[in-house]
């Protein structure tokens, strides 16, 4: 699996997520988010400079789950990649 | 590949374990699931773990399933207990990229009698 | 839940054959075909709907979106004998159709 990072960028808060998500030579064609505890996956709106974004109307719960489906037909899932307790410009790698 | 006992009894535990070839489970981005299939009928998922120990396990069978890994042996396990007449099926591992199950095992037939 | 049908289809050699999946809910384009053959691993042939899986023929080819899926073979062939199965995967858990059963006449 090509390495790949997510980045919280700022303006994330309890009710708005912001993630900048890398995948090694490639690009992000659909990026999804599960909420700890959630049997939904929910689409993220794709920014510019590859950040994606969600915004809900109830705080959001972490560890966060992620999915992605990548320009060149890639698709891949990690679960709890992004911490409860993020920080604000940390990058998060999957666990190996 | 699957492996585990072809025949189990009534009220005992269903064991299956299934071993990974051409890639590692630690290095992460896909859930390990299992399906099953009774005979005559469909495809029914029971649940997937990821290489963390996370899992997720199918309601309807949630409080019979445990699912283990190994990364060490690179392998991952189900346990089913309190089996009856009706987990009599095909049992299937495969690999799931989030979206879809991408790469399936062969599977194995596990009847449950006396 | 998902419903397909027909439930099964017998059809000869070079016809077009589709088989529809309704979902009960709206799951956006997150769809998966599968083919299942007797004694073989279910092999994936189509996800999001509409994408074709590596390596599967060009005869097989997905659309749909929301709650109404399809599954079209442009020109049936031998080999297509089998059991077509759809799956969504927009919310846990997973939860595959009840199949279609394709027959060559």
């Known amino acids: 699996v090509p390495k790949v990072t997510f980045t919280v960028e700022k303006g994330s808060n309890e009710k708005h997520l912001a993630v900048l998500v890398k995948y090694e030579g490639d690009t992000m064609a659909e990026v999804e988010l599960r909420e700890h505890g959630s049997d939904e996956w929910v689409a993220m709106t794709k920014g510019e400079g590859g950040v994606w974004t969600f915004d809900s109307e109830e705080p959001l719960q972490g560890p966060f789950n992620f999915r992605f489906l990548t320009e060149k037909g890639m698709k891949n899932v990690f679960d709890d990649v992004v911490p409860e307790k993020y920080t604000i410009g940390a990058t998060y790698a999957p666990e190996e | 590949l699957e492996s585990g006992p072809g025949l189990v009894k009534p009220s005992q535990t269903l064991s299956l374990t299934c071993t990974v070839s051409?890639?590692?489970?630690?290095?992460?981005?896909?859930?390990w699931s299992w399906i099953r299939q009774p005979p005559g009928k469909g495809l029914e998922w029971i649940g997937y773990i990821y290489h963390s120990g996370n899992t997720y396990y199918n309601p309807s069978l949630k409080s019979r399933v445990t699912m283990s890994v190994d990364t060490s042996k690179n392998h991952f396990s189900l346990r089913l207990s309190s089996v009856t007449a009706a987990d009599t099926a095909v049992y299937y591992c495969a690999r799931s990229d989030g979206y879809t199950l991408d790469n399936w095992g062969q599977g194995t037939l596990v009847t449950v009698s006396s | 839940e998902l419903t397909q049908s027909p439930s099964s289809v017998s059809a000869s050699v070079g016809d077009r054959v589709t088989i529809t999946c309704r979902a009960s809910q709206g799951i956006s384009s997150w769809l998966a075909w599968y083919q299942h053959q007797p004694g073989k691993a279910p092999k994936l042939l189509i996800y999001s709907a509409s994408s074709l899986q590596s390596g599967v023929p060009s005869r097989f080819s997905g659309s749909g979106y929301g709650t109404d899926f399809s599954l079209t073979i442009s020109s049936l062939q031998f080999e297509d004998s089998a059991t077509y199965y759809c799956q969504q995967a927009n919310s846990f858990p997973y939860t595959f159709g009840q199949g279609t059963k394709v027959e060559i006449k």
């Open positions: 051409g890639g590692s489970i630690r290095s992460g981005g896909y859930y």
